[in-house]
């Protein structure tokens, strides 16, 4: 990212390019790869965010058991379409003409099949289970500090709504944090939770998408939180569909 | 004051390759995007794509994927637009401008003329 | 990509007269700040003006006859009194997303 002028950058999306040709002259900052302007006081959606990643010049626990029907990103990296808002297209189709569904993560919902692939609706995933794992430490985190701090920096840093952080479960050495968020629930302004788990998981892998913060310092009353883990389950309102063969692999 | 200055006229054969150039003054270079545009003989406007000189970002009308290429050279102000393989239909007037949408200022066009 | 459709493709009015041309996108290119749509004169012979930027937002130097409005999907040019200056093509053009493409362009003549 290069800053067009004092001050015309993004604060929220380093995966821009800002320049001083906006309405009245002011900055405006566009998205790499799609072109598309970003508001920087919010977080980018993941779909704009992948698309310029793409395009850049590179038993009784207290801990949740994901559901059959939750998804793991297995796929990768891939250069999605995005609608006129920023957030993924229901199909998403690569170079070779293979096609899938995905849902409001991008993270794909169904076999892939041929240009002939039907994708009625972008189905929202309406709960994320984040699963940690910290590095050893001397003892145990006190867990309503870990839960404090958790909640605290989803609030702050990714801006996103108390009320969307249903639970933080702690059972050393593993976190998981629940977010959960229905369509109904979200109202025009709020962030979405998938685009928040998204920023997170990058902070986590020291890849924050911040403009020059530092990386994410995680400390629970002083003591260093380092992940050496991630895992992220994602739950969809209506289930995916996958033939019997996948689900038997 | 603000200016673009592109490079003069080309006639090429088809096949071949052509370089525009556009030298930009009166402003710093490096803070706007440059954006590229042609326009067929009697014909409306066409995107092509657009750079960012101080990084070098670009963007490309996928019609001009694989063909066009913008490149900028920072310490002389002047973006370049080549377009390779050129075919009788590329015959048009090739405008730099200064901004993404919205070129506010323009330079004063290129004629590319492709014949045998 | 995103196709833009101006109407009329000429239109012939008299001197003083007020001169509307219209341009659709084929999806909305607003937020609820901005419109991401622009509008240029070209004279035959010479390059694209900038006339307005972000819809209605004049640009510096051009005469105060001409205005922008719309939002959405739906934006008008208006020239209030026409002059015989103003005799040109005048085109639109969206900075939504990639390819920022223009209208086909509305030829504007003196009756």
């Known amino acids: 990212h290069t800053a067009a002028q004092d001050n015309c950058t993004c604060p929220t999306n380093k995966m821009t390019v800002c320049s001083p040709d906006g309405p009245g002259g002011r900055c405006q900052c566009r998205a790499l790869g799609s072109g598309m302007a970003v508001d920087c006081s919010t977080l980018t959606s993941k779909c704009l965010l992948l698309k310029a990643r793409m395009s850049a010049p590179k038993n009784a626990r207290t801990l949740v058991r994901p559901s059959e029907h939750a998804l793991v990103d297995n796929d990768g990296l891939y250069d999605p379409d995005c609608d006129p808002e920023g957030r993924f297209k229901a199909r998403q189709c690569n170079q070779t003409s293979v096609c899938w569904c995905v849902n409001s993560v991008g993270v794909r919902r169904t076999d892939k099949g041929d240009l002939s692939l039907r994708c009625d609706e972008l189905v929202r995933t309406h709960h994320i289970l984040i699963d940690l794992r910290h590095r050893p430490t001397a003892g145990a985190f006190n867990h309503s500090d870990l839960d404090a701090e958790l909640r605290r920096l989803f609030r702050e840093r990714y801006r996103l709504h108390p009320k969307f952080v249903a639970a933080v479960h702690y059972e050393q050495p593993t976190i998981q944090i629940e977010l959960r968020q229905n369509t109904s629930q979200k109202a025009a302004g709020d962030v979405d939770i998938g685009d928040a788990a998204y920023y997170f998981e990058r902070d986590i892998k020291g890849e924050s998408l911040f403009q020059g913060r530092g990386g994410l310092d995680l400390r629970v009353r002083g003591e260093p939180l380092q992940v050496e883990r991630t895992l992220i389950y994602y739950l969809d309102e209506i289930p995916p569909k996958f033939s019997m063969k996948r689900l038997t692999a | 004051q603000v200016q673009l200055v592109q490079s003069g006229a080309e006639v090429k054969k088809p096949g071949a390759s052509v370089k525009v150039s556009c030298k930009a003054s009166?402003?710093?270079?490096?803070?706007?995007?440059i954006g590229w545009v042609r326009q067929a003989p009697g014909q409306g406007l066409e995107w092509i794509g657009d750079i960012y000189p101080g990084g070098g970002y670009t963007n490309y009308n996928e019609k001009f994927k694989g063909r066009a290429t913008l490149t900028a050279d920072t310490s002389t102000s002047t973006a370049y637009m080549e377009l390779s393989s050129l075919r009788s239909e590329d015959t048009a007037v090739y405008y730099c401008a200064r901004g993404t949408g919205g070129g506010d200022y323009w330079g004063q066009g290129t004629l590319v003329t492709v014949s045998s | 990509d995103i196709v833009m459709t101006q109407s009329p493709d000429s239109l012939a009015v008299s001197l003083g007269e007020r001169a509307t041309i219209n341009c659709r996108a084929s999806q909305s290119v607003s937020t609820s700040s901005y419109s991401y749509m622009h509008w240029y004169q070209q004279k035959p012979g010479q390059p694209p003006k900038l006339l307005i930027k972000?819809?209605?937002n004049l640009e510096s130097g051009v005469p105060d006859r001409f205005s922008g409005s719309g939002s959405g999907t739906d934006f008008t040019l208006t020239i209030s009194s026409l002059q015989a200056e103003d005799v040109a093509v005048y085109y639109c053009?969206?900075?939504?997303?990639?390819?920022?493409?223009f209208g086909q362009g509305t030829k504007l003549e003196i009756k």
């Open positions: 009166g402003y710093t270079f490096t803070n706007y995007w």
């Open positions: 972000y819809a209605s």
């Open positions: 053009q969206h900075s939504w997303e990639i390819p920022y493409t």
